[in-house]
């Protein structure tokens, strides 16, 4: 899915209002220094691509994030604010239903969610490229100029 046409500000608002709190709950009891952030993103569509991948794609040692509250709210936000996103996710949803039902918080999952927090932080506050004296542009965000 191409996240270029999402309403980034609405997704950011959803994250700050609810998703971030669910991530904190998931990570409660974990020290911020425990994991090194190795996943990064360069612009807002890229950040959403990485966020989707880490949130919904099962990985070795962490197969259960898609059923977490933050994941469900992330999916809802993307479905609402990214045109056509829902249609692309039908197959993924079916695969999710076949996945294990039990929620197991492994150390690998905690590390993955720590990476997610870094990706969301980057998504929310991309540094703006400057053009001229007062015209700011972010290559990834042509339709949403006030993206802070």
């Amino acid at each position: 899915y191409d996240f270029t046409n999402c309403d980034f500000e609405k997704i950011k608002a959803a994250y700050l209002s609810t998703i971030s709190k669910d991530l904190i709950t998931y990570m409660s009891g974990t020290k911020s220094t425990e994991f090194n952030n190795t996943v990064s993103c360069s612009n807002r569509p890229h950040c959403l691509t990485e966020i989707q991948s880490l949130t919904f794609n099962p990985t070795a040692g962490c197969a259960s994030l898609a059923k977490e509250m933050f994941a469900m709210k992330t999916k809802a936000a993307l479905a609402i604010w990214c045109p056509g996103y829902s249609e692309t996710q039908i197959n993924a949803t079916q695969a999710m239903k076949k996945a294990r039902k039990s929620k197991v918080t492994t150390n690998k999952c905690l590390e993955q969610v720590s990476q997610l927090q870094g990706l969301w932080r980057r998504f929310n506050r991309p540094l703006l490229k400057q053009q001229g004296s007062s015209d700011y542009k972010d290559d990834d965000d042509k339709h949403h100029h006030h993206h802070h």
């Epitope: 911020s32 969301w120 932080r121 506050r125 700011y136 802070h148």
Partner: antibody, heavy 120, light 111 residues
Framework: EVQLVQSGAEVKKPGSSVKVSCKAS????????MHWVRQAPGQGLEWIGA????????SYNQKFKDRATLTVDKSTRTAYMELSSLRSEDTAVYYC?????????????WGQGTTVTVSS | EIVLTQSPATLSLSPGERATLSCRAS??????????MHWYQQKPGQAPRLLIY???NLGSGIPARFSGSGSGTDFTLTISSLEPEDFAVYYC?????????FGQGTKLEIK
């Protein structure tokens, strides 16, 4: 506990350059925007610019765009702010500040400040 | 750029009194229902300290006597009952539109 420790006070001649360092300890370094803010004696706070350590991307206040250079050294978890062509009006306390955990755009951790005096 | 105007420039009050500080933006700092306005306290010789983020949320470790309100262009920082340690300079800051800007500050002094 995240801490930002800045380099010591500097006295510089007009026309020269100064490079201030800001070393981060604790927490994650690479995924937090790092900002630089200055405060002239008896004056308010003025934003200079910001850098994202993950890839070195920068954003500058237009006022400082031609004279300020922000860099980072991820291996030592240190951010740098270099200001060139110094003039007396650049006499100020320079602060580094880390942006918050969520990307809300506030500064929750500040360095102790570095006093830069520009005098002939 | 967004200009933040704080008033009054100086506020003289006594401990125990209520303090109301204002910050007005030259254009809205709201985005998708959120107000990206933050408040800091600064004492002489110290770095600023975050008090309120996103208009009304209390920063970590900040006493409940501090509160923030407002949206759009008009914001208020209130200290319900002044303690001796509250006398300092207060700054508002917006992050909705680059460049990031601060207000010129309000000095809260003992009457």
């Amino acid at each position: 506990e995240v801490q930002l420790v800045q380099s010591g006070a500097e006295v510089k001649k007009p026309g020269s350059s100064v490079k201030v360092s800001c070393k981060a300890s604790g927490g994650t370094f690479s995924t937090y925007n790092m900002h630089w803010v200055r405060q002239a004696p008896g004056q308010g706070l003025e934003w200079i610019g910001a850098i994202y350590p993950g890839n070195g991307e920068t954003s500058y206040n237009q006022k400082f765009k031609d004279r300020a250079t922000l860099t980072v050294d991820k291996s030592t978890r240190t951010a740098y702010m270099e200001l060139s062509s110094l003039r007396s009006e650049d006499t100020a306390v320079y602060y580094c500040a880390r942006e918050d955990d969520y990307g809300e755009g506030y500064f929750d951790v500040w360095g102790q400040g570095t006093t830069v005096t520009v005098s002939s | 750029e967004i200009v933040l105007t704080q008033s009054p420039a100086t506020l003289s009050l006594s401990p125990g009194e209520r303090a109301t500080l204002s910050c007005r933006a030259s254009e809205s700092v709201d985005n998708s229902g959120l107000s990206f306005m933050h408040w800091y306290q600064q004492k002489p010789g110290q770095a600023p300290r975050l008090l309120i983020y996103r208009a009304s949320n209390l920063g970590s470790g900040i006493p409940a006597r501090f509160s923030g309100s407002g949206s759009g262009t008009d914001f208020t920082l209130t200290i319900s009952s002044l303690e001796p340690e509250d006398f300092a300079v207060y700054y508002c800051q917006q992050i909705n539109t680059d460049p990031l800007t601060f207000g010129q500050g309000t000095k809260l002094e003992i009457k």
